[in-house]
Interface confidence: low
């Protein structure tokens, strides 16, 4: 067992670790979500730029200082292009999110074009259809019961949207969606201790060829991709969606990460690599947006004044556009966009942010030198709730995102999508599908707390992402009944 004097020897302050778990006992035992634990660690040393912590037995650096974060994520990105998640590249491991720096460059160059404005506009009508079906479903349910658990409800919408936009699949019945959701949900909700194993013995999962993903999930994506490849006869179909891009890559056979295209840095596009990308798009496209929308609805239920302002904005914009929600109207709704940004400040879904040093690196403005392969962590949640950057941080206040207010803040004080070159590739897609759905909801319903609304909402400790423990229960009141 490695000793816990690594940071002491380097004069880096940090919390006292406990045997075996380091500073992650609560998250390793699934008592608290990892993001919450990191926020607590962030808060322990308010005067420090960096904090020395132990993930299980591995020393890691938690960075608090925003200027240092800017160096790591942007200025010195080439040192930190790896996320430092080491497990088998088989079985979904070579996906865009978890890939090492080189693999990520190879894939990222290819996938960025999926999310251009033109492509998003093409996807918008598919999102629209999904949102309309969703509203019909809510309206029908409302006749029986006005109380909803919105987190799982919204997952059915985002599941449809990502399925349609990325894979050209239509889930006709709620039942089909439930089946797919429950399989995919396993990856997020079933506690796998592989991550902790990796923290204790970095590289072990890779050496033993172990994955962090359950076999049932791997098989689901394999059959999904096989079916679509067969449907499209192995060739792009002209839909210009995610799957077409994948099929183009499949025809190429490999992608290269460096600008000269040398075969030394090329990635072979096997069916396994294709499955891995399908998987990450599915997960990233459905869970993150569903959770963000659920939290936004929760805050609107608790803040009726803000909800009234949003409803007024939605009504005004829809009236000016013959009742239609378009790609442009969604962008036009300034207050709606600010409320979305504020939701992500309070509930940043991916926590913590993680990078790995690819060489020894001196932390700017300090005497600390971190060794090659050290994991560096950033707590968006810690930053987003730091009163240094946000007054009264527990209060939901969209006005924080007035252009003037944003201009006053450090560019690294807001990190829901990460930062720099390796930020969230799908953030515009996520925003679009979320705001479209919220617009549709507010045009038809007023959201109110129900008798079961938990006003002291906790973070689910078992999930890898931030999410509401026990779901979010609110009432959806048809507006015709209200007015």
């Amino acid at each position: 067992m490695r000793t816990f004097n690594y940071w002491k020897k380097r004069n880096v302050r940090g919390p006292e670790p406990v045997v075996f778990f380091g500073n992650l006992k609560d998250s390793a035992l699934r008592k608290k979500n990892m993001g919450v634990v990191m926020e607590e660690l962030y808060n322990m040393f308010p005067e420090e730029k960096v904090i020395g912590i132990y993930r299980m037995t591995s020393p890691c650096l938690l960075v608090r200082d925003l200027d240092v974060i800017k160096h790591i994520m942007i200025k010195d990105f080439e040192v930190f292009s790896d996320r430092g998640v080491e497990f088998s590249k088989e079985g979904l491991g070579s996906n865009l999110f978890h890939a090492d720096g080189e693999t990520w460059r190879a894939l990222g160059n290819r996938f960025t074009p999926i999310f251009t404005s033109g492509k998003l506009k093409n996807m918008f009508y598919l999102m629209h259809e999904g949102a309309d079906n969703f509203i019909d479903h809510v309206s029908a349910e409302c006749e029986k019961n006005q109380e909803f658990e919105v987190h799982s409800l919204l997952q059915t919408y985002t599941m449809s949207t990502i399925a349609a936009c990325a894979f050209g699949i239509s889930y006709d019945s709620i039942g089909d969606k439930v089946k797919a959701l429950d399989i995919v949900d396993k990856i997020i909700s079933e506690p796998s201790y592989a991550i902790e194993l990796d923290m204790m013995y970095p590289g072990l999962l890779s050496k033993l060829n172990l994955s962090i993903f359950p076999t049932v999930v791997k098989n689901f994506f394999k059959s999904l991709v096989d079916n679509i490849v067969a449907q499209r006869n192995g060739k792009p179909s002209g839909r210009n969606d995610f799957m077409d891009l994948i099929l183009e890559l499949r025809q190429l056979g490999e992608v290269t990460s460096n600008k000269y295209g040398s075969s030394a840095s090329s990635l072979e596009i096997t069916d396994e690599v294709i499955c891995a990308q399908a998987f990450v798009f599915y997960i990233a496209g459905y869970e993150t947006s569903a959770t963000t929308m659920a939290y936004m609805i929760y805050q609107l239920a608790l803040n009726p004044d803000i909800q009234n302002k949003l409803i007024a904005e939605v009504d005004e914009v829809l009236k000016a556009n013959d009742g239609k929600v378009t790609y442009d109207t969604v962008k036009e709704m300034k207050y709606l966009n600010k409320a979305f940004d504020e939701t992500l400040r309070m509930y940043s879904i991916v926590e913590p942010l993680q990078r790995k040093a690819t060489r020894d690196y001196k932390i700017p403005g300090t005497d600390v030198v971190i060794e090659k392969d050290t994991i560096v962590l950033i707590s968006p949640r810690g930053i987003h709730y730091d009163p240094k950057y946000y007054d009264n941080p527990k209060q939901f206040n969209p006005d924080r995102f007035d252009a003037e207010e944003v201009g006053k803040r450090h560019p690294c004080a807001y990190l829901p999508f990460g930062l720099g070159q390796r930020n969230c590739i799908g953030m515009r897609f996520g925003r679009l599908q979320s705001l479209l759905c919220i617009t549709k909801i507010l045009s038809k319903f007023r959201i109110e707390p129900s008798k079961n609304t938990d006003r002291n909402l906790q973070v689910e400790p078992h999930r890898g992402l931030i999410g509401p423990k026990g779901g979010i229960r609110v009432n959806a009141i048809p507006r015709k009944l209200v007015s």
Partner: nanobody, 119 residues
């Protein structure tokens, strides 16, 4: 269709405990969560707890939080409700129900099992 069958009710002394079972059969893949309700004589039916099949998310109503424990056995398609420190006020017919994802409307119900707490 999802069929639900409760069992485990009966007469118990105050302070005692009880474990109710609910076995689900039929198209259980359609069911997202299972819940327990109770209805005391002359009162409305009250939702006491529910649990999601997929990730085990649990919810309890405030009135029962500390004494009731809901759990599931996916392999047996069975949900349990354990009740400790029973009080006369817990006397009711206990119903098991199942709901689809994304709504709190329970669409399938069991017949109910009587629990009577009395000395």
């Amino acid at each position: 269709q999802v069929q639900l069958q409760e069992s485990g009710g009966g007469l118990v002394q105050p302070g005692g405990s009880l474990r109710l079972s609910c076995a689900a059969s039929g198209r259980t893949s359609r069911s997202y969560a299972m819940g327990w309700f109770r209805q005391a004589p002359g009162k409305e039916r009250e939702h006491v707890a529910d649990i999601a099949w997929s990730d085990g998310r649990i919810y309890y109503s405030d009135s029962v939080k500390d004494r009731f424990t809901i759990s599931r056995d996916n392999a047996k398609n069975t949900v349990y409700l354990e009740i400790d420190s029973l009080k006369p006020g817990d006397t009711a017919v206990y119903y098991c129900a199942s709901r689809a994802r994304g709504t709190v409307s329970y669409n399938y119900w069991g017949q109910g099992t009587q629990v009577t707490v009395s000395s």
